[in-house]
């Protein structure tokens, strides 16, 4: 049977094409450095196909190697703001289950007002990813300035 | 029939592997903030497999979720140049059809001379992507410093 | 035969899913600007599925278009350190075979302490990728701050 037909017959999820792109919903209360995310077609260009949101954090549904990417822009910022409020740091990590807790990606703003990066990492079903923004500066909720996503790449 | 055989028999386009990587051709005239791109094997390592160029702007040929990425480096730049000429901003968006016009990705240079980012976004056949560089500084045309690309990820 | 079954029967390598994510091992001796990488499950979250390491440099095993990504963070760094030691530059390129030598991706640190970028590029079996860090500042070996990877995207 040709792959083109198989593609039409099998649900996309069985091909392992899990993918999500999220927009910022809000920051946590004062002692909680986590960013809280939201996604779905009603919200614009964000979506979840496979992964799910659990209280604003992204939970993985399929084992595999994922490309994780993020961009965060500070709401009020100039190069001097960023350096005066240093360190302002963004870290993406697995925050649960606790046994798998690890930092995957970390960047500081220094004299910039935006950080953007990406990496490949193995993730397992049930892993929850948290994005921690430490410091006093608030991130922008503009959907073209702040976003977070994952793409399943291979088993 | 084995997938390996199917891969050989079916044209790659039917597998949905649309992809493009472009290099800077030129900037627009004074009132036009758009960057104009070029691609093809004769130009080096740039290419278009599926998407097309329409007057230097990238037009999508297949509906789906795409990874869009860009890097732009300013040509004559130091951290003091960048801050003195602030705001210099790069925005990637859908510029036509007008009904779908939206900014997808936005970054400011602040005290840096390079911006680089990527995001997942749904695109539709016929969407044209524009990259607007606002400010007085010129981008480098070096192919390892300034480039723009898309990769089809899933339907 | 269903693709889901084909997926299980065929080795992943035949599907063209070559992928690698590396962590920094060490820098080169004084006159060698190359970064030396390492990867494998024993080292944490780094891995090589298809590509191989040759004396700390990444060698490609399958022709195709790849997404190449990198993040490098300087070890002891502030915005003033970075600007005082300018230029500190990171370049990713094909360093062998010599006939295919070319710079693929280049970024300067200016007043920042981290660079991160990604691009699509054609690579051929036998291409070896080198990452050259020029300047006097040392990179961090923290696995969430400095990493380098490739992902096969299409033939």
């Amino acid at each position: 049977q040709r792959f083109a037909q198989a593609q039409q017959q099998l649900p996309l999820e069985s091909l392992g094409w899990d993918v999500a792109e999220l927009q910022l919903n809000h920051t946590g209360p004062q002692q909680d450095p986590r960013l809280y995310w939201q996604g779905g077609p009603a919200l614009g260009r964000s979506f979840l196909h496979g992964p799910e949101l659990d209280k604003g954090q992204l939970r993985i549904h399929r084992d595999g190697i994922y490309m994780v990417h993020i961009q965060v822009t500070l709401a009020i910022c100039s190069s001097t703001t960023a350096s005066r409020h240093h360190p302002t740091t963004l870290a993406v990590g697995i925050c649960s289950p606790a046994s798998r807790s690890i930092s995957l990606l970390r960047l500081s703003f220094h004299q910039g007002c935006t950080i953007a990066s990406q990496r490949l990492t193995p993730l397992a079903r049930g892993d929850t990813l948290c994005t921690n923004l430490t410091g006093t500066l608030l991130p922008s909720r503009n959907t073209d300035e702040t976003f977070f996503g994952v793409q399943w790449v291979r088993p | 029939q084995r997938f390996a055989q199917a891969q050989q028999q079916l044209p790659l386009e039917s597998l949905g592997w649309d992809v493009a990587e472009l290099q800077l051709n030129h900037t627009g005239p004074q009132q036009d903030p758009r960057l104009y791109w070029q691609g093809g094997p004769a130009l080096g390592r740039s290419f278009l497999h599926g998407p097309e160029l329409d007057k230097g702007q990238l037009r999508i040929h297949r509906d789906g979720i795409y990874m869009v990425h860009i890097q732009v480096t300013l040509a004559i730049c130091s951290s003091t140049t960048a801050s003195r000429h602030h705001p210099t901003t790069l925005a990637v968006g859908i510029c036509s059809p007008a009904s779908r016009s939206i900014s997808l990705l936005r970054l400011s240079f602040h005290q840096g001379c390079t911006i680089a980012s990527q995001r997942l976004t749904p695109l539709a056949r016929g969407d044209t992507l524009c990259t607007n560089l606002t400010g007085t500084l010129l981008p480098s045309r070096n192919t390892d410093e300034t480039f723009f690309g898309v990769q089809w990820v899933r339907p | 035969q269903r693709f889901a079954q084909a997926q299980q029967q065929l080795p992943l390598e035949s599907l063209g899913w070559d992928v690698a994510e590396l962590q920094l091992n060490h820098t080169g001796p004084q006159q060698d600007p190359r970064l030396y990488w390492q990867g494998g499950p024993a080292l944490g979250r780094s891995f090589l599925h298809g590509p191989e390491l040759d004396k700390g440099q990444l060698r490609i095993h399958r022709d195709g278009i790849y997404m190449v990504h990198i993040q490098v963070t300087l070890a002891i760094c502030s915005s003033t350190t970075a600007s005082r030691h300018h230029p500190t530059t990171l370049a990713v390129g094909i360093c062998s075979p010599a006939s295919r030598s070319i710079s693929l991706l280049r970024l300067s640190f200016h007043q920042g302490c981290t660079i991160a970028s990604q691009r699509l590029t054609p690579l051929a079996r036998g291409d070896t990728l080198c990452t050259n860090l020029t300047g006097t500042l040392l990179p961090s070996r923290n696995t969430d701050e400095t990493f380098f990877g490739v992902q096969w995207v299409r033939p």
Epitope: N25, H26, Q30, A42, L43, R141 | - | -
Partner: nanobody, 119 residues
Framework: EVQLVESGGGMVQAGGSLRLSCAAP????????MGWYRQAPGKQRELVAL???????NYADSVEGRFTISRDNAKNTVYLQMNSLKPEDTAVYYC?????????????WGQGTQVSVSS
Amino acid sequence: EVQLVESGGGMVQAGGSLRLSCAAPGKIFSFYFMGWYRQAPGKQRELVALITGDGRTNYADSVEGRFTISRDNAKNTVYLQMNSLKPEDTAVYYCYADVFARAGRDEYWGQGTQVSVSS
């Protein structure tokens, strides 16, 4: 269309003070942040101060230490106290609200109030 209503602008000598007020309809007082943008002639609009729903504040470098943003929940009002004003603070000041909404967010603006600082 929800409108934010600003007041308090005017003319003042350098070194003087003004207090801007922004009244918001009660139904939008669940916000990510409320803040004040300003736009001087020929310049881009810039965000100069914001206050979050839980009272955190951020300021632009140019106004930090001189301007103070605050809110009165009972009156659904946000204030911008501007001290030690400088000629370069001359601009139209706009109240802004980034509001939680069913569609992710809504953004609301005031009509603007002119602040003129003479030397």
